[in-house]
């Protein structure tokens, strides 16, 4: 039985040209995390974090995506096109798969504040 929950940073905003941390956290389960997949709103695969092999950042994003902190992902040099949904998929044993959603809004305004709080979707 899947008892865990994914907590995410929910809806966040960040300035164009800046950076943002996408973070998911799996709680309420003792399941072993074997892999975390990060996917972008246009269905591009950004990165995979395999428990044995470590991080694999897809070459198309290597110049703008940094692994971490933890199982999260840091997006750098943000553009307006980065606005949209991001998904973390936790592969666990023995529970199975958990999925979390984050919505990122990239703002032109220089007064945009980086806002983030953990949410349960």
């Amino acid at each position: 039985m899947m008892t865990g929950t994914i907590e995410t940073t929910g809806n966040i905003s960040a300035k164009k040209g800046g950076s943002v941390i996408l973070q998911c956290h799996l709680s309420s389960t003792m399941a072993q995390v074997t892999q975390v997949n990060w996917e972008q709103h246009d269905h591009s695969l950004l990165a995979i974090r395999n428990a044995e092999l470590g991080w694999h950042i897809y070459p198309a994003f290597k110049d703008r995506v940094a692994p971490g902190p933890g199982l999260g992902l840091t997006l750098q040099s943000l553009t307006m096109n980065d606005t949209g949904e991001y998904f973390c998929t936790y592969h666990t044993y023995p529970d199975g798969t958990y999925r979390g959603r984050i919505f990122l809004e990239v703002l032109e305004s220089s007064v945009a504040e980086h806002s983030a709080r953990f949410q349960i979707p």
């Epitope: 074997t34 892999q35 591009s44 695969l45 044995e52 092999l53 070459p59 198309a60 044993y93």
Partner: antibody
Framework: QLQLQESGPGLVKPSETLSLTCTVS??????????WGWIRQPPGKGLEWIGS???????YYNPSLKSRVTISVDTSKNQFSLKLSSVTAADTAVYYC?????????????WGQGTLVTVSS | EIVLTQSPATLSLSPGERATLSCRAS??????LAWYQQKPGQAPRLLIY???NRATGIPARFSGSGSGTDFTLTISSLEPEDFAVYYC????????FGGGTKVEIK
């Protein structure tokens, strides 16, 4: 020499689930750093990657197919399997299994000979 | 999704001639591009990886070039066994393949 061999029914009815198995010989499916993938080719058409799995059971899928795809692994038999649900005539194809060196950013280097699956009532 | 467009769809040549096949990506794939050869009833065979490196056992008449969005596979002098369909594949994001170029005997 690494060899891969696909097996499974050659005929599946529309709306049912296609199930195939790939048996790996000449090497261990548990060998570190390799994923194992499925690729298909409709008659007279091009190639389409379906998804891949690590021996731990962690997967990554083609976003356009992932709602219908499940890939699993049985390390004790040195096998991995594909299930594709709710099939239609458009899923008629030769299905190949292959070794996927994801973490080397490398192409599929070893392939099975392929098995034709026809979707028809 | 990174879309790969191959041209021409068909190339009609004679043995001994030079074949030049093109693959264009919808966005940069750097050098993460491979070429495969496929003959009827067979699985694809890896020819070139990382845009220009020949796979093990591939004859020197096969060469690859390009980076970014434009890539070329060249067969310097066609042998009878080279008449087949050729596919490019990118690895910069989740794997996608081009539509293929058929090299046929003229």
């Amino acid at each position: 020499q690494l060899q891969l061999q696909e097996s499974g029914p050659g005929l599946v009815k529309p709306s049912e689930t296609l199930s195939l198995t790939c048996t790996v010989s000449g090497g261990s499916i548990s060998s570190s750093s390799y994923y194992w993938g499925w690729i298909r080719q409709p008659p007279g058409k091009g190639l389409e990657w379906i998804g891949s799995i690590y021996y731990s059971g962690s997967t990554y899928y083609n976003p356009s197919l992932k709602s219908r795809v499940t890939i699993s692994v049985d390390t004790s038999k040195n096998q991995f399997s594909l299930k594709l649900s709710s099939v239609t005539a458009a899923d008629t194809a030769v299905y190949y299994c292959a070794r996927d060196p994801l973490y080397q950013d490398a192409p599929f280097d070893y392939w099975g000979q392929g098995t034709l699956v026809t979707v028809s009532s | 999704e990174i879309v790969l467009t191959q041209s021409p769809a068909t190339l009609s040549l004679s043995p001994g001639e030079r074949a030049t096949l093109s693959c264009r990506a919808s966005q940069s794939v750097s050098s993460y591009l491979a070429w495969y050869q496929q003959k009827p009833g067979q699985a694809p065979r890896l020819l070139i990886y990382d845009a220009s490196n020949r796979a093990t056992g591939i004859p020197a008449r096969f060469s690859g070039s390009g980076s970014g969005t434009d890539f070329t596979l060249t067969i310097s002098s066609l042998e009878p066994e080279d008449f087949a369909v050729y596919y490019c594949q990118q690895r910069a994001n989740f794997p996608t393949f081009g539509g293929g170029t058929k090299v046929e005997i003229k």
